[in-house]
Amino acid sequence: YDFTNCDFEKIKAAYLSTISKDLITYMSGTKSTEFNNTVSCSNRPHCLTEIQSLTFNPTAGCASLAKEMFAMKTKAALAIWCPGYSETQINATQAMKKARKSKVTTNKCLEQVSQLQGLWRRFNRPLLKQQ
């Protein structure tokens, strides 16, 4: 999906009002210096591309974040403020339904969410190019 035509300011508002708080809740009890950020992003479409991929792609040691509150709100924000995004996510939704029902917070998932926080912070930088 090409995130170029999203309403970035609306997504930013959704992040600041709720998603950021859910990410902090998920990371509660973890020191902010515990994980090194190894990925970043260039402009806002790039940031959303990486945020979407990191939030919804299973990785080694962290099978699924998709059922977490911040992930569901991220998906909703992208669906509302990125034209045509929902249509591209039908297969992804099917995969999400097949994901584990139980939510287990592993150290790898904490590290992944720490990376997500960094990507979201970069997305919100005032000087970051729209595209």
């Epitope: 992003c41 790039h46 991929s53």
Partner: antibody
Framework: QVQLQESGPGLVKPSETLSLTCTVS?????????WSWIRQPPGKGLEWIGY???????SYNPSLKSRVTISVDTSKNQFSLKLSSVTAADTAVYYC??????????WGQGTLVTVSS | EIVLTQSPATLSLSPGERATLSCRAS??????LAWYQQKPGQAPRLLIY???SRATGIPARFSGSGSGTDFTLTISSLEPEDFAVYYC??????????FGQGTKVEIK
Amino acid sequence: QVQLQESGPGLVKPSETLSLTCTVSGYSISSGYGWSWIRQPPGKGLEWIGYISYYGSISYNPSLKSRVTISVDTSKNQFSLKLSSVTAADTAVYYCARTNLLYFDSWGQGTLVTVSS
Amino acid sequence: EIVLTQSPATLSLSPGERATLSCRASQSVSNNLAWYQQKPGQAPRLLIYDASSRATGIPARFSGSGSGTDFTLTISSLEPEDFAVYYCQQYSDWPQYTFGQGTKVEIK
């Protein structure tokens, strides 16, 4: 200390597919970062080809996108480049590099690929 | 595509002298700029990122400055091992990351 090493044929025929592999040691490619390819034609400057992140997102240089595939084999701690329909203009030293998806902090030593019949 | 123009193409200096290399972007890249050093037959090495932050292990004689379209790499006092080609790279314009054409710093 992460180390990267490119391998693959040094000679490829025009119209064929160039295939290179980068073997990473000292760091698990599924643990973090992005893994990138960059090339440098003889005596010329650098050109970014693309990357694959540790969580599977892929990005390509738009000028090469139609011909490039980057993939990863986590079991071997390797990532690969395929460039199809090559011409003499694709003759270059090809580097693999570790990236934070912005800049490139560790590089392989490079491998020269010549496109010629 | 953002074009990076480096100047001069070649800089002839003696060890101990100060080197000032320029990189100009065709449009603003904020501070999204890196500098690399490349010696003959070797891979590039990251020197500077975010326009002014030194990469791990890079000596303090290397410094970067600038923002927007005009950037400078300064080597305060050239050591023999500093004679090489230097490239700038912008990462403001994903997915079109570009490099400058390079500046060669040679022994006078």
